[in-house]
């Protein structure tokens, strides 16, 4: 029987800068029941606080609700593991909520084949930002990435769309059915999951007009 091994806070995520959750990985338990507590203080403060919510994020997590979440302030946190034989502490983790946003996927993905008479035909893709993200304040810049592939293909073709919410793709295989998805990330933050796939049938006459 031994004191617990050193835990590690390995991930923190926020859906929208208004709440966030951090997760830790326990060390060895030393063969004894082990209790974990996360404590934190904000940059420039000395007063330590305990995690406000160990439930919402699931096992080995701490959730910070709206009233505990401040933007532009660094949180300095650590996890304490304690059993009958002693304690061990994780390294301190410095967290700025502005940098840990992982948004929901973009919404309203629409895909259409456009065949103008005087120009090469193209696939037109359009989407909307996720609803929880407030782009009007200027706090967020969202970047987008599109992926598409013929239904039976193994490899995805990926296009970076920057900040725009629509995109044109010219080179496609006529007669094929394509899957299209889009995802987004803040300029400092994490990629969302891919949106649900939208299917589009490319016409057999999808060729450059003379």
């Amino acid at each position: 029987q031994l004191p617990p091994g050193k835990p590690e806070i390995f991930k923190c995520r926020s859906p929208n800068k208004e709440t966030f959750t951090c997760w830790w990985r326990p060390g060895t338990d030393g063969g004894l029941p082990t209790n974990y507590s996360l404590t934190y203080h904000r940059e420039g403060e000395t007063l330590m606080h305990e995690c406000p919510d160990y439930i919402t994020g699931g096992p080995n997590s701490c959730h910070f609700g709206k009233q505990y979440t401040s933007m532009w302030r660094t949180y300095i946190m650590m996890v304490n593991a304690t059993n009958q034989m002693g304690s061990s502490f994780s390294d301190e983790l410095y967290v700025d909520v502005t940098y840990i946003v992982q948004p929901d996927p973009p919404l309203e993905l629409a895909v259409e084949v456009k065949q103008p008479e005087d120009r090469k035909p193209y696939l037109w893709i359009k989407w909307s930002p996720p609803t929880l993200i407030d782009l009007k304040t200027g706090w967020f810049t969202l970047l987008y990435e599109i992926r598409l592939k013929p239904e039976k293909a193994a490899e995805w073709e990926i296009h970076f769309a920057g900040q725009q919410t629509e995109f044109k793709i010219l080179s496609l295989h006529p007669g094929q059915k394509y899957l299209v998805q889009v995802r987004c990330k803040p300029d400092h933050g994490y990629w969302s999951a891919w949106s649900p796939a939208t299917f589009i049938q490319i016409p057999s006459d999808f060729t450059m007009n003379d």
């Epitope: 390995f10 660094t74 700025d96 940098y99 990629w191």
Partner: antibody
Framework: EVQLVQSGAEVKKPGSSVKVSCKAS????????MHWVRQAPGQGLEWIGE????????NYNQKFKDRATLTVDKSTSTAYMELSSLRSEDTAVYYC?????????????WGQGTLVTVSS | DIQMTQSPSSVSASVGDRVTITCKAS??????VAWYQQKPGKSPKLLIY???NRYTGVPSRFSDSGSGTDFTLTISSLQPEDFATYFC?????????FGGGTKVEIK
């Protein structure tokens, strides 16, 4: 204990490429951005670029955008910096540096440095 | 790019002296400034982040004041292990940039 261990010194010819590695241990590699910084002999520090090991998303100093490539191998917790079209002024010590936290770009852990000498 | 201008480029001082190093940013950077210490043949070591917050384990004799464009690193009572070169760094906008360094030498 957090450690960043870099590959050994390199001597390269002008026009060639060099690839420096940085093996991370003592923490979850995918949690923190990794940066690359260089220091020419007797000079200051110059930031090359940064990479998020969780998804390989990277940002570069425009000065190096066309010549530097940052990559990671998650299976071995190793970051790489490749610099192409080397010239004599690229002679420097190249450092990998781990982001201090999940936040802005200040650097709490540094590799020991890799001296790259470019000489004909 | 934001230029970070450090002064002086070198300073001679004795153990117990108060030493101040200044760093001036060419544009507003808020408090997005860090300070590092580097000894010959070694990697830089983080001292201060967000302009005024000492990193874990850094002695209290190191402090920073300033925000906006003007920053000052103060060593309140110089110790033998403090003789080194000090760099400031801004992380307000890409590319992250460093000052040219200030060498603190033994008088």
């Amino acid at each position: 204990e957090v450690q960043l261990v870099q590959s050994g010194a390199e001597v390269k010819k002008p026009g060639s490429s060099v690839k420096v590695s940085c093996k991370a241990s003592g923490y979850t590699f995918t949690t923190y951005w990794m940066h690359w910084v260089r220091q020419a002999p007797g000079q200051g520090l110059e930031w090359i670029g940064e990479i998020d090991p969780s998804d390989s998303y990277s940002n570069y100093n425009q000065k190096f955008k066309d010549r530097a490539t940052l990559t990671v191998d998650k299976s071995t917790s190793t970051a790489y910096m490749e610099l192409s079209s080397l010239r004599s002024e690229d002679t420097a010590v190249y450092y990998c540096a781990r982001n201090g936290g999940l936040g802005p770009a200040w650097f709490s852990y540094w590799g020991q440095g890799t001296l790259v000498t470019v000489s004909s | 790019d934001i230029q970070m201008t450090q002064s002086p480029s070198s300073v001679s001082a004795s153990v117990g002296d108060r030493v101040t190093i200044t760093c001036k940013a060419s544009q507003y950077v808020g408090t997005a400034v860090a300070w590092y210490q580097q000894k010959p043949g070694k990697s830089p070591k983080l001292l201060i982040y967000s302009a005024s917050n000492r990193y874990t384990g850094v002695p209290s004799r190191f402090s920073d004041s300033g925000s906006g464009t003007d920053f000052t690193l103060t060593i309140s009572s110089l110790q033998p292990e403090d003789f080194a070169t000090y760099f400031c760094q801004q992380y307000s906008s890409y590319p992250w940039t460093f000052g040219g360094g200030t060498k603190v030498e033994i008088k």
